[in-house]
Each structure stands twice: as C-alpha cells, then as structure tokens.
C-alpha cells in the first residue's frame, strides 16, 4: 500500500491533522524534498550574517558575511575576521607575513615565495608581503648578446599616422 504522504511535493508537508493531505509550508519554513511530515524553520541571517538568498517554500535561506568578515564552515555557519593583504590570522590576531612569505588575500595563511631557481629561472620581480616573486628567464638566457625580452615598439603620438 503506497504511503499517501509520498505524493506531497517539496514546499508542502503531509498534514496528519487533516487526513494526511498535502499542506503548504507555513511562512518562514520550507521542505526541500517530497514526502515530508514537517517543514523546517528557515534560517535567519542576523547580525554579522547577511542574507545571500531568501528562504522559499522549497529551499532554506543562505547567508554570507558582512564586509570585514568571510564565511567559515558548512553553509557559512561562522564569520571569521578578515586581515589585510600581507597578513595572516594567528591566535594573537592579524600579523604581518614573515620575510620570504606572502598573502595576496584577506584570509588564509602566508605562503612562501616561489623559489625561481628550482625551475632554473631567475627572479624578475622581488616578492613582497602581499605578492609572490615573479620568475623571469633562466640565467643562461640573460647572457650577453642574448635578447631576453622583445623591445617595445616606439610610442607614437596620438593623432599621427606613421610616415
């Protein structure tokens, strides 16, 4: 014998008080699958949590974090404080990246600069707390007489066509 509740679609619940007919979820509740005997209460995004997606009868609300914080945990269950680029969050708060490391985001940890020599390359641009080093051509490519970079075309003044 088929369970009459299995016919109740998402957005409804099987109402035992009304001969197991399918009733719509009440306001501020939802059911994301069919055959539910109750609807779940919608999540409320309060305080540091902002509403990213409103609750509907078939899906829960989704929250994100107010500026200055970023989401942590499944479904953004927590908001962690941002740091500045060039810093990482430690047990003592936001701390500058140590020399030889960088962080180009407001979250996460400082990572070591790329070691260009491991790829047989030279450092073209030094690293900073906020940016990784930029590796250039290998030192052999920079020997005298070797053109490592194509020189830029001479600049022209706007409005003048070449002679």
């Amino acid at each position: 014998l088929q369970d009459p509740c299995s016919n109740c679609p998402a957005g409804t619940f099987c109402d035992n008080n009304r001969n197991q007919i399918c009733s719509p979820c009440p306001p501020n509740s939802f059911s994301s699958a069919g055959g539910q005997r109750t609807c779940d209460i919608c999540r409320q995004c309060k305080g540091v949590f902002r509403t990213r997606k409103e609750c509907s009868s078939t899906s829960n609300a989704e929250c994100d974090c107010t500026p200055g914080f970023h989401c942590l945990g499944a479904g953004c269950s927590m908001c962690e404080q941002d740091c500045k680029q060039g810093q990482e969050l430690t047990k003592k708060g936001c701390k500058d990246c140590c020399f030889g490391t960088f962080n180009d985001q407001k979250r996460g940890i400082c990572r070591p600069w790329t070691n260009c020599s491991l790829d047989g390359k030279s450092v073209l641009v030094n690293g900073t707390k906020e940016r990784d080093v930029v590796c250039g051509p290998s030192p052999a490519d920079l020997s005298p007489g070797a053109s490592s970079v194509t020189p830029p075309a001479p600049a022209r003044e706007p409005g003048h066509s070449p002679q």
Partner: nanobody, 124 residues
Framework: QVQLVESGGGLVQPGGSLRLSCSAS????????MSWVRQAPGKGLEWVSD????????FYEDSVKGRFTISRDNAKNTLYLQMNSLRAEDTAVYYC?????????????????WGQGTLVTVSG
C-alpha cells in the same frame, strides 16, 4: 576552566536604564567574540547582540538597535550591555556567551560557554 559571570540586572521602570556586566576568566578573552542572549518568561532564547574580539564590530537584534550598546574592556576581561529606553518586552534573563573559535563570530547554536544569567525586569 572557562567562567562567565553576569551582574547588573534588577527591576527598572519603563524608559529606564541598566548596565549589565559579564566578567570572564579561564580563556584569552581578547581573542574571542562575545554575545548577549536573552530569554523572556515562557519564551525561547533570543540573540541580542554580538561584539568581535577587538570591539570595533558590533551587531544588534532589530528590536534593540539604537537602545542597547554592547562593549568590552579587554584589559578587564569584561563584557558590557548598556540598556536604555527599556520596555516591558525587554524583561528577560540575560546571558553572556563566548564564541567557539578565535576571531570568529558564530551562530547562537555554536556558542560554547554561557553564563548563569542575570534577570532584568521592566515594570512600572
């Protein structure tokens, strides 16, 4: 061990003010966000306010915005709630609570330590 002890509750007339305090010990207070939560007679828990670890970011339940101010003194390991323009509907037991991770604000379900509460009664 972590301890949170609230004080400052009492009986006050509508329109009056109270300042609640929460003295914290047993953890590095300055590294954790803190909250005030209340429970009115016969009702469920209601989040009131959050403050981040450094005190520069504060958040409030809509019904208390502009009337309540959360603050903290990290040197004294103390959390405060200044309550002005009190109404009968603010009558509740007020709890302070600690968030579970450093420099992180959680939802009320995840707070890991709570005080024993202090009763605020607003009645004329």
């Amino acid at each position: 061990q972590v301890q949170l002890v609230e004080s400052g509750g009492g009986l006050v007339q509508p329109g009056g003010s109270l300042r609640l305090s929460c003295s914290a010990s047993g953890f590095t207070f300055s590294s954790y966000a803190m909250s005030w939560v209340r429970q009115a007679p016969g009702k469920g828990l209601e989040w009131v306010s959050d403050i981040n670890s450094g005190g520069e970011s504060t958040f409030y339940e809509d019904s208390v915005k502009g009337r309540f101010t959360i603050s903290r003194d990290n040197a004294k390991n103390t959390l405060y709630l200044q309550m002005n323009s009190l109404r009968a509907e603010d009558t509740a037991v007020y709890y302070c609570a600690k968030h579970p991770l450093t420099y992180t604000i959680a939802t009320m379900n995840d707070y890991d330590y709570w005080g024993q509460g202090t009763l605020v009664t607003v009645s004329g």
